[in-house]
Each structure stands twice: as C-alpha cells, then as structure tokens.
C-alpha cells in the first residue's frame, strides 16, 4: 500500500459529559471516491478498534447504530466525536484513514490524540 500523511491534535480533554471531539485530516494524493476512517485506542501497548466508518466523498460518515462515534466530513477533514467516555477510557486515540476506491490503495495512520477523561464528582446530598 502507499503511505499517506494523517494529522490529528496531540491532546483533547473530554467534556464533563464524557464527549470528546477532534479533527482528523489527511493529505489525499489521489481522487478517492470512498474513504474508510477507523479510530483505534492504544493503552498499555494494546490496540483496539473503537469504531469505523466508510463514506463517499461529499457524503456523511455512517457509523453502525450502536457505535459510540459520530462524525462529519469536509474535503480531506473528518470531524470525529466519541461519546460515553469514562475515566477508564483515557488513552491514545489513533486515526487511521484508508483510500478504498478507486485504486491505488492508500493508508495513513496519525500519531494519535491523547484523550483525557475525568469522571464528574457525584453531587453531594443537599439539605434544605
């Protein structure tokens, strides 16, 4: 496969509701009509797939119904949002981009975005 540069932010802090968003940008060397984006999580030297979506250029990303990810695309940029995050989900989230169609096949893997998730403190009981 041919290499492709993928850029993503180094660090993102998830919101108090456990939502983190970041942009994944790829330098497309060809005129791809179909692109596959995969988010991988690396923690303790283990890599797991968080979510993946294939989209046609100019169309929206379609993740599986039960996916924790949503996203939109604009040109060579993909805006990714991961929901339902908890403190234990803190880790390095890597954006992998594949130009699937037409040939040639290009593969790009970003350096990863460190997502920090802090569980909100439980509200103390209030006496009125």
């Amino acid at each position: 496969c041919k290499a492709m540069h993928v850029a993503q932010p180094a660090v993102v802090l998830a919101s108090s509701r456990g939502i983190a968003s970041f942009v994944c940008e790829y330098a497309s060397p060809g005129k791809a009509t179909e692109v596959r984006v995969t988010v991988l999580r690396q923690a303790d030297s283990q890599v797991t797939e968080v979510c993946a979506a294939t989209y046609m250029m100019g169309n929206e990303l379609t993740f599986l119904d039960d996916s924790i990810c949503t996203g939109t695309s604009s040109g060579n940029q993909v805006n990714l949002t991961i929901q339902g995050l908890r403190a234990m989900d803190t880790g390095l989230y890597i954006c992998k981009v594949e130009l699937m169609y037409p040939p040639p096949y290009y593969l790009g893997i970003g350096n990863g975005t460190q997502i920090y998730v802090i569980d909100p403190e439980p509200c103390p009981d209030s006496d009125f």
Partner: antibody, heavy 118, light 107 residues
C-alpha cells in the same frame, strides 16, 4: 468462516442474459470492495468489474462496459453481475472476489461457468 | 492500461528446487502487486500482497520482492503441492490487470 458462494451460471444463447450472484458470509460485507474476474477455457485471469463497499462507485473492463452492470445489496450480503447481450467470447468461469489489502483479491468464490452458444 | 508480463511462461522443476518467477509492469505500480496460485478446476488463492507481504496461512517458503516495475515470486524449496499456475496482478489503477500466468511443472 469467511466465504463467498456463487450461483447463477449456465448455458445461454448469444444475445441472451444471465444474472450471477455471490453470497458473502463471515465478514462485514459493506466494508469491502468486491470484484468479478473471469477465466476463459484454457486462458488466464481477466478482471471484469469492481464495486466500492457502499455500491456508489463501479468500474468495468472495456470488454464488458455497458453490458455487465455490477451491483450489491449490503442488506443481503450479496454481490451481483447482470450479464446482457452475451457473446461467444464471454464464455468463461466467473469468479467473485473480495478486495483485500493493496487491491489484492483475498477471498474467492468457487466459480460459476457461463457458456454462450447457439 | 498497465500490461503485466510474466516470465517464464512455464518452468519445469524438481522437489526441493528453488524457483523464481518474474513479473514486469509496463509502468510504475509502486508496490501494488499481488501473486496468486491456481490449481486446475479451482479458484485462485492469494499468496502475496503489497509485493512482499505473505498472506496469513501461506507457507514461508513463498516470498515476494520488488517495487516499481519489476517483481519476483520465489519458492525456496518446492513441495509437491506447489505445482500449479502462478499469476501476478497489479492493483495500482483500473483496469486491474493480470500477468499471463506461469505454469510450474514437475521435471
């Protein structure tokens, strides 16, 4: 396990039509490019057509362009090749294949024979 | 269209021999090359993808090399089950094209 099961071949007269089907199982069908490849008796392999995972993009060999539309139904995990205006030179074993890394073809159907003869 | 030319078109060899098949592309295809093995009456089987990557489950006696326009498939020590026809295929651009095949026969 991962497999492709083909159906729909047979004997047809010149000018006739056939529809080949390729049922996929064991993998996420919609994530893969799919292709048709044929092999005439005693000859080598010839690429016929490919379709993107969503079905939104298709490409064809010049020899079949306009005659053999490729399609897929991702809800049924099935690939199709509609063969129209068949000619004697279309006689071959037709294989469906899954697109693998770097546009290789990593999983192949068992093949189905199409014979065009009067 | 990119033409793929294999050589030799046929080769006779003995069990244990080292055999190399070559494939030339009419233009630069980087490493977008695959090799297949086909036995009579059977579907082709992927051996090598990306010019040099061995497909999982394929014996390590098979290896691929090359880049650009010149590629090789080497079988380090022929086994009885290796006698078959071998094809190269470029995946750099449409139309996808195959070499004409190399028939490997028992000497």
């Amino acid at each position: 396990q991962v497999q492709l099961v083909q159906s729909g071949g047979g004997l047809v007269q010149p000018g006739g039509s056939l529809r080949l089907s390729c049922a996929a199982s064991g993998f996420t069908f919609s994530s893969y490019v799919m292709s048709w490849v044929r092999q005439a008796p005693g000859k080598g392999l010839e690429w016929v057509s490919s379709i993107s995972g969503s079905g939104g993009s298709t490409d064809y060999a010049d020899s079949v362009k306009g005659r053999f539309p490729i399609s897929r139904d991702n809800s049924k995990n099935t690939l199709y090749l509609e063969m129209n205006s068949l000619r004697a030179e279309d006689t071959a074993v037709y294989y469906c294949a899954r697109g693998g890394s770097a546009w290789s073809l990593d999983i192949w159907g068992q093949g189905t024979t199409v014979t065009v003869s009067s | 269209d990119i033409q793929m030319t294999q050589s030799p078109s046929s080769v006779s060899a003995s069990i244990g021999d080292r055999v190399t098949i070559t494939c030339r592309a009419s233009q630069d295809i980087s490493n977008s090359l695959a090799w297949y093995q086909q036995k009579p009456g059977k579907a082709p089987k992927l051996l090598i993808y990306g010019a040099s990557n061995l497909r999982s489950g394929v014996p390590s006696r098979f290896s691929g090399g090359g880049s650009g326009t010149y590629f090789t498939l080497t079988i380090s020590s022929l086994q009885p089950e290796d006698f078959a026809t071998y094809y190269c295929q470029q995946g750099n651009s449409f139309p996808i094209t195959f070499g004409q095949g190399t028939r490997l026969e028992i000497k």
